[in-house]
Interface confidence: medium
């Protein structure tokens, strides 16, 4: 019986060009985490395997960094990074737990709108 729950950072926003940490936490279960997958829609971003360590998908290796912990750091954000991200916890013996994070990447307020906030 699956008793655990996934806590996530929920809906988050960040500025274009910046970085963001995606974080999930599995609680209320004694199941052993064997692997965590990080996915965006149907794309695999990274995995953290308990025995084999981290693997970042080749197409994301320049902009994705492992950690902190089982989390994932996205760098050099673009507006195309806006969307749903999923942390998929493979556990034994419970099975699979999935958490959802929605990331909105905003145009930089300084770069795009800085002039209108200047003090005369």
């Amino acid at each position: 019986m699956m008793t655990g729950t996934i806590e996530t950072t929920g809906n988050i926003s960040a500025e274009k060009g910046g970085s963001i940490i995606l974080q999930c936490h599995l609680s209320s279960t004694t199941a052993q985490v064997t692997q965590v997958n990080w996915e965006q829609q149907d794309q695999l971003l990274a995995i953290c395997n308990a025995d084999l360590g981290w693997h970042i998908s080749p197409s994301f290796k320049d902009r994705v960094a492992p950690g902190p912990g089982l989390g994932l750091t996205l760098q050099s954000l673009t507006v195309n990074d806006t969307g749903e991200y999923f942390c998929i916890y493979h556990t034994y013996p419970d099975g699979t737990y999935t958490g959802r994070i929605f990331l909105e990447v905003l145009e930089s307020s300084v770069a795009e709108h800085g002039a209108r906030f200047q003090i005369p």
Epitope: T34, N37, D42, I47, N49, L52, G53, H55, P58, H90
Partner: nanobody, 124 residues
Framework: EVQLVESGGGLVQPGGSLRLSCAAS????????MGWFRQAPGKEREFVAA?????????SYADSVKGRFTISADNSKNTAYLQMNSLKPEDTAVYYC????????????????WGQGTLVTVSS
């Protein structure tokens, strides 16, 4: 739906080599690892090796084959390979390819597709 077809099995003398192939039909999107397992007559199926499908940088081997077997994946051909060197009579078994969600200490967790198997016989 993904289907797996193994090939490359056969009869080989002790100390010889074989290369097994596992061709996947269909698009592998959710699989993280491709794994090889084997089942000897009268024994349970056991883990042999696994490789991450995207990138190939993570590999795992059973202690009994470390240093003798090498697993790899060619995404462009949708095929995983098992290069078996220094074969021993105790390597005789039907070898199965499997699509895995997880590799590591819990090899049998998260497996959702099996091939039909290919027989490897090591005998003089």
């Amino acid at each position: 739906e993904v289907q797996l077809v193994e090939s490359g099995g056969g009869l080989v003398q002790p100390g010889g080599s074989l290369r097994l192939s596992c061709a996947a039909s269909g698009t592998i999107t959710s699989a993280v690892f491709m794994g090889w397992f084997r089942q000897a007559p009268g024994k349970e199926r056991e883990f042999v090796a696994a490789v991450i499908w995207r990138g190939g940088s993570l590999k795992s081997y059973a202690d009994s084959v470390k240093g003798r077997f090498t697993i790899s994946a060619d995404n462009s051909k949708n095929t995983a390979y098992l290069q078996m060197n220094s074969l021993k009579p105790e390597d005789t078994a039907v070898y199965y390819c499997a699509k895995l969600a997880v590799a590591g200490n819990y090899y049998y967790y998260g497996m959702d597709v099996w091939g039909q198997g290919t027989l490897v016989t090591v005998s003089s």
